[in-house]
């Protein structure tokens, strides 16, 4: 997704001569190349732009379909419940909403990558804000779920169930409010900008370099490091409790715990490592050179795609690892009169009809 104005060094004549001789695109320079004035090589965008043009539209289209179907199914299963949702289920519903809203913007970014931004500045601001709101919301809601389970299992404190039902809603509202706050720069600085170098219009940030670096640091800390630390801390303690109590159900639950954290970490760590490299280059801690700049651009595209896959991964995890989710899904299909499911009219074997499919208790962790 193109969300930031790219920047290039001002070429001097030695570099233009190299460009005219047509070898600059395949030329690689040493890692310790100095970034003194204009002696660094030209960094043609051709490769990374062509890569984006080919790779991103296909990936975004696939993720759009998978994310919409998967998260739609999760929302449908949760909303089809006749009883009140548990705290974890409420967070999961909000997570499904966040992931759905995020994938809804992907077709726009696919068009932006393939051709140009044709939707105007208004939609650019909305789509950019929506994208980042839900990027942050996804991570923070996962942190909330882990904290809820941590209190639930480690401290045997059912914070949200024992308190007023509004407490979980307030927590979710606080998360959305915080995400809206994080997305303010999008509303202010995003616009459809005609790039005369590329002779195309793109939805891009339009603010000073300092702001750009600050926003990336915020994204790295608030959207990844903080939620990951919360998840790691909470789930490490949950694992400790489950390991002490042993038992097959708990061991199965332990596997699920690991899957949740690992999925988030695997999907988002590569992207944030690339962002970290870019931040270090922005701050001058890492020297810029053509090879590195080109590799970072391509790596950003690949790893961000991997990150967005996380939106589609949650429903798959519930479906393949969460027994209760599958059962609820079958029940929903039966209720909708799905012809292929008529022979499957059996009661769920491992849970009461009104139990939460993601519920976590000290005795049982069949969550997700």
């Amino acid at each position: 997704m193109v969300l930031e104005v790219s920047d290039h060094q001002v070429l001097n004549d030695a570099e233009v001569a190299a460009l005219l001789e047509n070898f600059s695109s395949s030329y690689d320079y040493g890692e310790n190349e100095s970034d003194s004035c204009c002696t660094s090589p030209p960094c043609p965008q051709d490769f990374s732009l062509n890569f984006d043009r080919a790779f991103l539209p296909a990936l975004y289209s696939l993720l759009f379909l998978l994310g919409l179907l998967g998260n739609g199914a999760v929302a449908a299963v949760l909303l089809s419940r006749r009883t009140a949702l548990s705290s974890t289920d409420t967070f999961l519903l909000h997570l499904a909403v966040a992931d759905t809203l995020l994938v809804l913007t992907l077709p726009l970014w696919a068009v932006d990558a393939a051709v140009q931004w044709v939707f105007g500045s208004g939609l650019c601001k909305v789509a950019g804000a929506l994208f980042n709101i839900n990027f942050y919301a996804g991570a923070l809601l996962l942190a909330c779920i882990s904290f809820d389970r941590y209190l639930n299992i480690v401290h045997a404190t059912q914070l949200y169930r024992r308190g007023p039902p509004a407490r979980v809603t307030l927590t979710c509202l606080a998360v959305w409010g915080l995400c809206l706050l994080f997305a303010l720069p999008d509303f202010i600085f995003l616009s459809a900008h005609h790039d005369e170098r590329l002779n195309a219009t793109h939805c891009q940030y339009n603010f000073p370099q300092v702001g750009r670096t600050a926003l990336r640091v915020l994204q790295l800390v608030a959207g990844f490091l903080l939620p990951l630390l919360v998840m790691a801390y909470c789930y490490a303690h949950i694992l400790a409790v489950l390991l002490v109590s042993r038992g097959q159900r708990r061991l199965r639950a332990m596997r699920l715990v690991v899957v949740v954290v690992v999925a988030f970490a695997l999907c988002w760590t590569p992207y944030h490592l690339v962002v970290l490299v870019d931040i270090l280059m922005d701050l001058g801690a890492l020297a810029r050179n053509c090879g590195r700049e080109s590799r970072v651009d391509v790596a950003k595209s690949v790893t961000s795609g991997l990150g967005y896959m996380h939106c589609c991964l949650n429903p798959l995890l519930y479906a393949f690892v969460g027994v209760k989710f599958r059962e609820r899904m079958w029940m929903l299909l039966l209720r909708l009169g799905c012809p292929n499911q008529r022979g499957l009219q059996r009661q769920p074997s491992s849970s009461r009809r009104d139990s939460s499919w993601s519920e976590t208790s000290e005795a049982s962790y069949s969550g997700l």
């Epitope: 290039h8 001002v10 070429l11 030695a14 004035c37």
Partner: antibody
Framework: EVQLLESGGGLVQPGGSLRLSCAAS????????MSWVRQAPGKGLEWVAT????????YYPDSVKGRFTISRDNAKNTLYLQMNSLRAEDTAVYYC????????????????WGQGTLVTVSS | DIQLTQSPSFLSASVGDRVTITCRAS?????LYWYQQKPGKAPKLWIY???TLASGVPSRFSGSGSGNEYTLTISSLQPEDFATYYC?????????FGQGTKLEIK
């Protein structure tokens, strides 16, 4: 029509500071690298500073490095030059100049210039 | 630093004359650029990439050269050509200008 309008010049004492601005119009400011070039009274031209189109890269000659800072606000289509520790030899007309686009990147000559703003450093 | 030395510094000529201004570089440069400046005005790009005329520059102007020596030639001097001409290199930092050649009416 491309227009560059400098402002902020004036009389300043040695050791003092001054901030010059250059308001750009008639072109997509965010697509172009920009520079400041100065001309001492009755003398030739001297390159002072350059900034890349996104503001990530800045370049200076040794004569001003550490004293002058070039920056830009792409939202306001404005280029700045913050001048600190001014010396008598910094007295000049300061021009804001645009770099043309070349082959997807930038070339170092200047295709458009502003009318200039006079900075006088004197006690 | 690459020093650019223009010669002559002053040149008196008449309308219709053929005029050549030379710019010598202390080290080899890839390209040379020429600017025209009239009194009290900002410089204007005149010739870029050694020989390419900027938009609106009459065809009587031409540029040539390579390495250390470059020239700007006016085949038939016109009244509007009287001005100061500066050469500039952008091969290595700092990006320097020549001291200028002032073209005056004889």
């Amino acid at each position: 029509e491309v227009q560059l309008l400098e402002s902020g010049g004036g009389l300043v004492q040695p050791g003092g500071s001054l901030r010059l601005s250059c308001a750009a119009s008639g072109f997509t400011f965010t697509s172009y690298a920009m520079s400041w070039v100065r001309q001492a009274p009755g003398k030739g031209l001297e390159w002072v500073a350059t900034i890349s189109h996104g503001g990530r890269y800045t370049y200076y000659p040794d004569s001003v490095k550490g004293r002058f800072t070039i920056s830009r606000d792409n939202a306001k289509n404005t280029l700045y030059l913050q001048m600190n520790s001014l010396r008598a030899e910094d007295t000049a007309v300061y021009y804001c100049a645009r770099h043309p686009i070349y082959s997807g990147n930038y070339q170092g000559y200047f295709d458009y210039w502003g009318q200039g703003t006079l900075v006088t450093v004197s006690s | 630093d690459i020093q650019l030395t223009q010669s002559p510094s002053f040149l008196s000529a008449s309308v219709g004359d053929r005029v050549t201004i030379t710019c010598r570089a202390s080290s080899g440069v890839n390209y040379l650029y020429w600017y025209q400046q009239k009194p009290g005005k900002a410089p204007k790009l005149w010739i870029y990439f050694t020989s390419t005329l900027a938009s609106g520059v009459p065809s009587r102007f031409s540029g040539s050269g390579s390495g250390n020596e470059y020239t700007l030639t006016i085949s038939s001097l016109q009244p509007e050509d009287f001005a100061t001409y500066y050469c500039q290199q952008f091969t290595s930092s700092p990006y320097t200008f020549g001291q200028g050649t002032k073209l005056e009416i004889k």
